[in-house]
């Protein structure tokens, strides 16, 4: 006989990422004896909640909680039974609920209460359902990316922890209702609301972060539609041959399109609108989303928001990734430079509906949105955030790192479960050959 070492016990954590268009559940795991190590927490499994985001259940809060049941039942299977009681469960809602909270705080509260009621019925250690601020969403996305890529600290072969010389990565997240940019900066922010000080593994990080509400993909598309209805009898970003009927109430119900709402509009009126495949007019329409007219600081990104110059490498995830991946994979277009990204956007915007459908078989209606989406991503990065060709070369578009989805959820859990200590880790026991 010989001694067989038992695998280390695993701990688990669950985060429900309640986005504006849908909810995703992430289950994370880590060895119980290495809780304070870096790069140790990874994704165990995930589950996409069917239906829309929880904010879409404003008129039916119980529907929001009911929608989560399938994934929660999966969690019961995915997490070993003996670990259920010790597994923290969090729900974080983002910009969809921030918007609902602005327009209908009572409905927002009701949805969170209904969801809380359901989550407490499960044997996990439920630790709350809340709406994240834009700043939290940005910072936790940055923490996730850098944690997964082991940019905070590494364990050296001589048995010592050290800070990698490569520095941290900036993070850019494009959600359904908001977009976030977060990166480490050396100088203090001129706008204190955009600065976060972090202490991780004994290191100090000064981080710039800003979240632009109403600049998520879905809300941008809705704002462009409102603009097209206002200024054209057609939609320049939609493909020629794409024909819709629009209920005005559906366009103007969002607080993001409130400014474009006609004074006396009939919410039940229907308008027919077709696409025109016009890249130049589409570019003009997208440009109208950004204002560069005033800046109360030494420099701004857009809409008078302070932003230091982008520095270092960046990871762009969520809808940034999906948009660029569509251009690269479905359309077969190069997007390695800003110039190529712009050319790819123009290429998609030139396609007719029949051409697009032939290129990407199946009647996927969201195909009609890729022109506007690509044009927006290109303009947001170049004109909005100020990436030039050199800086753009340092942007990677990624969905996962170390088999774990890049997003705010992991960073949120790491923070709330104290899996990233503020103090430096002690030396490991072992042989030092020096």
């Amino acid at each position: 006989t010989r001694d067989v070492r038992e695998p280390p016990a695993l701990k688990y954590g669950i985060v429900l990422d309640a986005g504006s268009s849908h909810t995703s559940m992430f289950i994370y795991k880590w060895p119980a004896d290495k809780e304070n190590d870096t790069g140790i927490v990874g994704q165990h499994s995930s589950c996409d909640v069917p239906g829309g985001g929880i904010s879409s259940y404003a008129d039916n809060p119980s529907g929001a909680s009911q929608s989560l049941v399938g994934c929660l039942e999966q969690a019961l299977q995915d997490v070993p039974k003996e670990r259920h009681a010790g597994t923290p469960l969090y729900l974080g809602a983002t910009a969809g609920m921030r918007l609902l909270n602005l327009t209908n705080p009572e409905a927002s509260t009701s949805v969170l209460m209904a969801v809380t009621h359901t989550l407490t019925q499960y044997p996990f250690d439920f630790r709350g359902a809340r709406i994240l601020s834009g700043q939290e969403e940005g910072v936790f996305g940055w923490v996730t990316a850098n944690y997964l890529l082991e940019n905070f600290i590494k364990y050296g072969w001589v048995g010592r922890w050290f800070r990698p010389r490569k520095g941290t990565l900036g993070a850019m997240d494009l959600g359904g209702a908001s977009t976030q940019i977060t990166f480490e900066t050396t100088s203090p922010a001129e706008d204190r609301a955009s600065e976060v000080q972090l202490h991780l593994y004994g290191q100090h990080y000064r981080v710039y972060t800003h979240s632009f509400l109403c600049y998520g993909r879905d809300q941008v598309l809705q704002r462009l539609l409102a603009s097209a209805l206002q200024t054209h009898g057609f939609h320049p970003c939609w493909p020629r041959g794409f024909s819709t009927q629009v209920l005005l109430g559906d366009v103007y119900q969002s607080p993001c399109t409130m400014a474009q709402r006609p004074q006396n509009f009939n919410s039940s009126a229907r308008v027919s609108l077709s696409g025109s495949s016009d890249p130049h007019l589409c570019r003009d329409l997208v440009s109208g989303l950004f204002s560069f007219s005033s800046c109360p600081f030494s420099r701004c990104s857009f809409n008078g928001v302070f932003q230091p110059p982008v520095a270092g490498n960046f990871v762009a995830f969520s809808a940034f990734f999906y948009t660029v991946d569509f251009l690269r994979t479905s359309m077969g277009l190069p997007v390695a430079t800003l110039q190529q990204l712009e050319a790819a956007a123009v290429n998609v915007c030139n396609q007719t509906w029949a051409q697009l459908q032939a290129r990407v078989p199946g009647q996927r209606a969201r195909l009609a949105d890729y022109c506007a989406g690509a044009m927006f991503v290109q303009q947001l990065l170049s004109r909005g955030y100020g990436f030039d060709e050199r800086a753009f070369g340092g942007v990677i578009f990624q969905k996962k790192a170390a088999d774990t989805a890049v997003g705010w959820a992991l960073g949120y859990m790491l923070n709330l479960t104290n899996l990233i200590p503020a103090d430096p880790p002690g030396l490991r026991k072992g042989t030092d050959f020096s």
Epitope: S21, H22, P50, G51, G52, G53, D218, Q222, L225, R240, G241, F242, S243, T244, Q245, V246, L247, D250, V251, S272, L273, S274, T352, W353, A354, Q357, P361, G362, Q363, R364, A365, R366, A368
Partner: antibody, heavy 124, light 111 residues
Framework: DIQLQESGPGLVKPSQSLSLTCSVT?????????WNWIRQFPGNKLEWMGY???????NYNPSLKNRISITRDTSKNQFFLKLSSVTTEDTATYYC?????????????????WGQGTSVTVSS | DTVLTQSPASLAVSLGQRATISCKAS??????????MNWYQQKPGQPPKLLIY???NLESGIPARFSGSGSGTDFTLNIHPVEEEDAATYYC?????????FGGGTKLEIK
Amino acid sequence: DIQLQESGPGLVKPSQSLSLTCSVTGYSITSGYYWNWIRQFPGNKLEWMGYISYDGDNNYNPSLKNRISITRDTSKNQFFLKLSSVTTEDTATYYCAGGYYRYGLSYYYVMDYWGQGTSVTVSS
Amino acid sequence: DTVLTQSPASLAVSLGQRATISCKASQSVDYDGNSYMNWYQQKPGQPPKLLIYAASNLESGIPARFSGSGSGTDFTLNIHPVEEEDAATYYCQQSNEDPPTFGGGTKLEIK
């Protein structure tokens, strides 16, 4: 109000071609929408056959691709179905319908305007 | 092609009661958090008429006693309270991918 009306022979011989016309009133077929043909078999099963879009592009059901042709005459505001090499299996009620993408944060293809249908029997 | 299977093939419901019709898809008809499922009503001698789009959105002019729910592969049409004029055949239809396909229909009879 948009109205559609099918017309054509009620009886077609096997191996021949079936030709039907859909006349549209109340809306120009070049202004927007997709102009579909759908058929309903004797057992009530519905099958989408294809469409011609407002700008003249076609989209056909792959199961009929080699036999179907949908064309239009914009001056008469009509669109047509031609189905070749028919068999008794093509006996059905044929409907023309106007469709479009209904917006609601995404786009949902619906067929909202229908003709009354015309019955076609394939028999020798 | 996406095959849609409706059940039951027919049902008889008393006036004022609830009618529930199920539609099961051979593959998910969801994309990007949206469900591409429509419901149509067809009365004898008439063409189909759109009732519900996007799984749960009521077409304008359709009474609120009609409601749709579901996502992924499982969808339901509910009618409550059932009225005399609701006697018809009901079809589900997916538009997530080409070609659009219809379910086999459910015939509703009022007792």
